[in-house]
């Protein structure tokens, strides 16, 4: 399969974020980052990592979404939702479900 | 297998123009960046263009900014090269090659571009 | 734009030599440096990626180091196929530049 060659010690990631030097990057690892600022869109931003493993494993939450992955270009087709608010009015367990 | 074929060289006038093409088959050509590259006759390498797997970003050569256009057509797994306003020393081999995205490493067989009155 | 330095510009050399070949970036590039081969007539091939990476099939007397600005390109001992013009490209920053390109020439 000529899209998966032999691993080396680093990956080869799509970038695409207002950072990147190039279209991609190279790093131990590949990242694609949900980010939603107040009163904007959310914004995907995809990239290398390198630092701080540890954001991989954390919950989306409304207002950010991190992802990692370990192989060559895996962050280039991977789509992210943030965690869904819910309105005052429709708190859990008072719908009669 | 991996393929990249080049075509849409030939002649052409100082201050012409020229399209280069790419066909790509055998790889996920959607997800990979890729770039044009140039020899001139008995010379180097001389990076030219690349653009990102989506086509949003796109990045040149200050000796071609301006004057050159990359795109891609994913539907099409085609990649292409807009030339504009050619000059003598525009006249090279031109290749289509997956670089920048190592360790993929396709290149096609080039076509040949000469800017000659 | 980075400049790439590369030397020298040709290289006499024979089979079973140790010969080493020079790349110098004008600014910081920390590893993010390739080799490229090319034979007449044929489009280059990709030998070591990433400063020391080797690229799958590649043979290991092929060795690459560097840091920063100055870089390396290693061949243990020549072999015949081995004759053919050396390239360093840097793709840590947009535009990328290659070097001028080392010809390997048998003496």
């Known amino acids: 399969d000529p899209v998966k060659p032999s691993r080396g010690p680093l990956v080869t990631c799509t970038c695409e974020s207002p950072h990147c030097k190039g279209p991609t990057c190279r790093g131990a690892w590949c990242t694609v980052v949900l980010v939603r600022e107040e009163g904007r869109h959310p914004q995907e931003h995809r990239g290398c990592g390198n630092l701080h493993r540890e954001l991989c494993r954390g919950r989306p939450t409304e207002f950010v979404n991190h992802y990692c992955c370990d192989s060559h270009l895996c962050n280039h087709n991977v789509s992210l939702v943030l965690e869904a608010t819910q309105p005052p009015s429709e708190q859990p367990g008072t719908d009669g479900q | 297998e991996v393929q990249l074929l080049e075509s849409g060289g030939g002649l052409v006038q100082p201050g012409g123009s020229l399209r280069l093409s790419c066909a790509a088959s055998?790889?996920?050509?959607?997800?990979?960046?890729m770039s044009w590259v140039r020899q001139a006759p008995g010379k180097g390498l001389d990076w030219v263009s690349a653009i990102g797997g989506r086509g949003g970003s796109t990045y040149y050569a200050d000796s071609v900014k301006g004057r050159f256009t990359i795109s891609r057509d994913n539907s099409k797994n085609t990649l292409f090269l807009q030339m504009n306003s050619l000059r003598a020393e525009d006249t090279a081999v031109y290749y289509c090659?997956?670089?920048?995205?190592?360790?993929?490493?396709?290149w096609g067989q080039g076509t040949l571009v000469t800017v000659s009155s | 734009a980075i400049q790439m330095t590369q030397s020298p510009s040709s290289l006499s050399a024979s089979v079973g030599d140790r010969v080493t070949i020079t790349c110098r970036a004008s600014?910081?590039?920390?590893?993010?440096l390739g080799w490229y081969q090319q034979r007449p007539g044929k489009a280059p091939q990709l030998l070591i990626y990433a400063t020391s990476i080797l690229q799958s099939g590649v043979p290991s007397r092929f060795s690459g180091s560097g840091s920063g600005t100055v870089f390396t390109l290693t061949i243990s001992s020549l072999q015949p196929e081995d004759f053919a013009t050396y390239y360093c490209?840097?793709?840590?920053?947009?535009?990328?530049?290659f070097g001028q390109g080392t010809k390997l020439e048998i003496k």
């Open positions: 090659a997956s670089q920048p995205t190592p360790p993929f490493d396709y």
């Open positions: 490209l840097q793709d840590y920053n947009y535009p990328c530049n």
């Open positions: 055998g790889f996920a050509f959607n997800s990979f960046a």
């Open positions: 600014q910081d590039i920390r590893n993010d």
